[in-house]
Interface confidence: low
């Protein structure tokens, strides 16, 4: 099950080399759990694997498995970083008919600095 | 299936450079990462940096740095490693090999190319 | 950088014998290490990718486990065609490194 409102440690393969440790769910997409954001995850790694652009996987991680620190905030990709990766990765995306997530599109994502990222409560929806 | 055929030996002077040429096949060239690992007589492997067919984007490894070159052709299919101001620990086997992804594994690797860097 | 260590360096079997190899990471790598085997004057050959996936192809005597820092290569048969030097990698962060190898002669 999954606990509320509380960090848990990652444990997606992929996303395990990351700067940040804990994640918390349910993510941007609704994702209720790790093992169902890891198979969601699976559509985009063509993007990965073919380095579209060298921020995809930083990108994907946090939009997928994000960070979540000292319990009640969960940080959200910055919409910069949106920008630059989509902007980096439409022509593959076109290729593979790869579906965007609403959620993830970039103008519903905040200006914030990567280095210190906006935060959100969990227990409110984040709207950017 | 893919197939990756690199260029033939090469003798260098020392301070010489040297450029290695990987022809990709069987599949679209833009689907590559390529990667150069090199083995010097008798010893282990060494990964020196890859280059994606996709976008070029390359990442080298810090023992390199500033003396490798890594380029891609994708009118031919043919991704390059030019390697600067050689010395005679530069002999080796170089390799070139498909990357899963921009980390992963290597799979299929070409023949390599001998380069005998000697006076 | 990551340091893989592999033992041992070199190991003399027969046909017929289990053979293990280890590779030990320097820091956790998850299951990001990669298996691979080289004849005299070939290049290296893919065994088994994401420690204990078998490649297309590739005999099922050999097998991968391991995980975190920890990872084994058996052999569980050893047939003629194996002798060879097996080398581990890991692919968990650039710069991607390889162990020293080992080394399977015939006894």
């Known amino acids: 099950g999954h606990s509320l409102f509380t960090c848990e440690p990652i444990t997606v393969p992929r996303c395990m080399k990351m700067a940040y440790n804990m994640t918390f769910f349910p993510n941007l997409m609704g994702h209720y759990d790790q093992s169902i954001a890891a198979v969601e995850m699976e559509h985009f790694l063509p993007l990965a694997n073919l380095e579209c652009s060298p921020n995809i996987e930083t990108f994907l991680c946090k939009a997928f498995v994000p960070t979540c620190i000292e319990q009640i905030h969960v940080v959200p990709p910055c919409r910069k970083l949106c920008e630059k990766v989509y902007s980096d990765c439409k022509k593959l995306i076109d290729t593979f008919g790869i579906r965007w997530p609403e959620e993830l599109e970039c103008d519903r994502l905040q200006y914030c600095d990567e280095t210190v990222p906006v935060t959100f409560d969990p227990h409110t929806e984040f709207l950017g | 299936q893919v197939q990756l055929v690199q260029s033939g030996a090469e003798v260098k002077k020392p301070g010489a450079s040297v450029k290695v040429s990987c022809k990709a096949s069987g599949d679209t060239f833009s689907n590559y990462v390529i990667s150069w690992v090199r083995q010097a007589p008798g010893q282990g492997l060494e990964w020196m940096g890859r280059i994606s067919a996709y976008n070029g984007y390359k990442s080298y490894a810090q023992n390199f740095q500033g003396r490798v070159t890594m380029t891609r052709d994708t009118s031919t299919s043919t991704v390059y490693m030019e390697l600067s101001s050689l010395r005679s620990e530069d002999t080796a086997v170089y390799y070139c090999?498909?990357?899963?992804?921009?980390?992963?594994?290597?799979?299929?690797w070409g023949q390599g190319t001998l380069v005998t860097v000697s006076s | 950088d990551i340091q893989m260590t592999q033992s041992p360096s070199s190991l003399s079997a027969s046909v017929g014998d289990r053979v293990t190899i280890t590779c030990r990471a320097s820091?956790?790598?998850?299951?990001?290490l990669n298996w691979y085997q080289q004849k005299p004057g070939k290049a290296p050959k893919l065994l088994i990718y994401?420690?204990?996936s078998l490649q297309s192809g590739v005999p099922s005597r050999f097998s991968g486990s391991g995980s975190g820092t920890d990872f084994t290569l058996t052999i569980s048969s050893l047939q003629p065609e194996d002798f060879a030097t097996y080398y581990c990698?890991?692919?968990?962060?650039?710069?991607?490194?390889f162990g020293g190898g080992t080394k399977v002669e015939i006894k």
């Open positions: 990698q890991q692919s968990y962060s650039t710069p991607l490194t």
């Open positions: 090999a498909r990357s899963s992804g921009y980390v992963g594994w290597f799979d299929p």
């Open positions: 820091q956790s790598i998850s299951s990001y």
């Open positions: 994401a420690a204990s």
